[in-house]
Interface confidence: low
Amino acid sequence: CKAMHVAQPAVVLASSRGIASFVCEYASPGKATEVRVTVLRQADSQVTEVCAATYMMGNELTFLDDSICTGTSSGNQVNLTIQGLRAMDTGLYICKVELMYPPPYYLGIGNGTQIYVIDPEPCPDSDF
């Protein structure tokens, strides 16, 4: 397959509600009409698929209903949001982009975004 450059931020800090957002940008060599975006998590040399979506250019990304990911696309940029994160989910999140159609097929894998998740401190009991 043909290689394609994918850029993503090096570091992102998740919000106190366990939500992290980052942009995945790819250098499209041609006029793709169908794009597949996959988010992979690398931790302790293990790589697991977090979520994936295939979308038609100009349309919204549609992840599975039970997916922890949502996203929007604009040109060659995909704005990804991962929710429900906890401290144990801290790790390197890699954006993989495939230009599926029309041929030729292109594959690009980003260097990864290190997402740091800090569980919120429990609220102290208050005496009212």
């Epitope: 397959c1 038609m56 030729p104």
Partner: antibody
Framework: QLQLQESGPGLVKPSETLSLTCTVS??????????WGWIRQPPGKGLEWIGS???????YYNPSLKSRVTISVDTSKNQFSLELSSVAAADTAVYYC????????????????WGQGTLVTVSS | DIQMTQSPSSLSASVGDRVTITCRAS??????LNWYQQKPGKAPKLLIY???SLQSGVPSRFSGSGSGTDFTLTISSLQPEDFATYYC?????????FGQGTKLEIK
């Protein structure tokens, strides 16, 4: 088991429009994993790709036929259609509809399911 | 358009023979090549995709190889049901183009 069935008139007059429909059964035409295509084969000759369509309506045509070809899809009927305008004797061929599958990881596409084909003769 | 040239255009062989059909692309198509078998009055049948991957249900005597511009379909030991016409197809870029076909006949 997926099945594709072409239907339409077997005889078309020169300068008229050839219209064929492919009905898909045993699977949904709306699957995001597949495209749907038309291929033709003049008697005793080789195969020629005409064009492909995605369920959303995105189309891809052979430039040699583009000015005369329209491919459309009707997801409610699980069908896709071919129209070829201003036909001539050279358009006489067996017309096949087929599913275009994608093999994840290799970037490979292929026609894996075909209709049995329908012969269309262009003659007055 | 990418031109696909098959050779030979026809071939006579006997049951049990090893047969090789070649397909040459006018420019590099990586491994974006498929092989089809067609029998008279029937639709083509997919044999090989991605230049060398055997389609499910296809006998292992069929194999494909090659990359770039030169590709080969090999039938290791011809069976009576293998006498047919074989086509290569490139899908590296639009328009998809087929080779002109190789007719395999009984000697």
């Amino acid at each position: 088991q997926l099945q594709l069935q072409e239907s339409g008139p077997g005889l078309v007059k020169p300068s008229e429009t050839l219209s064929l429909t492919c009905t898909v059964s045993g699977g949904s035409i709306s699957s995001s994993s597949y495209y749907w295509g038309w291929i033709r084969q003049p008697p005793g000759k080789g195969l020629e790709w005409i064009g492909s369509i995605y369920y959303s309506g995105s189309t891809y045509y052979n430039p040699s036929l583009k000015s005369r070809v329209t491919i459309s899809v009707d997801t409610s009927k699980n069908q896709f259609s071919l129209e070829l305008s201003s036909v001539a004797a050279a358009d006489t061929a067996v017309y096949y509809c087929a599913r275009v599958s994608y093999y994840y990881g290799s970037g490979s596409y292929y026609f894996d399911y075909w209709g049995q084909g329908t012969l269309v003769t262009v003659s007055s | 358009d990418i031109q696909m040239t098959q050779s030979p255009s026809s071939l006579s062989a006997s049951v049990g023979d090893r047969v090789t059909i070649t397909c040459r692309a006018s420019q590099s198509i990586s491994s974006y090549l498929n092989w089809y078998q067609q029998k008279p009055g029937k639709a083509p049948k997919l044999l090989i995709y991605a230049a060398s991957s055997l389609q499910s249900g296809v006998p292992s005597r069929f194999s494909g190889s090659g990359s770039g511009t030169d590709f080969t379909l090999t039938i290791s030991s011809l069976q009576p049901e293998d006498f047919a016409t074989y086509y290569c197809l490139q899908h590296n870029s639009y328009p998809y183009t087929f080779g002109q076909g190789t007719k395999l006949e009984i000697k």
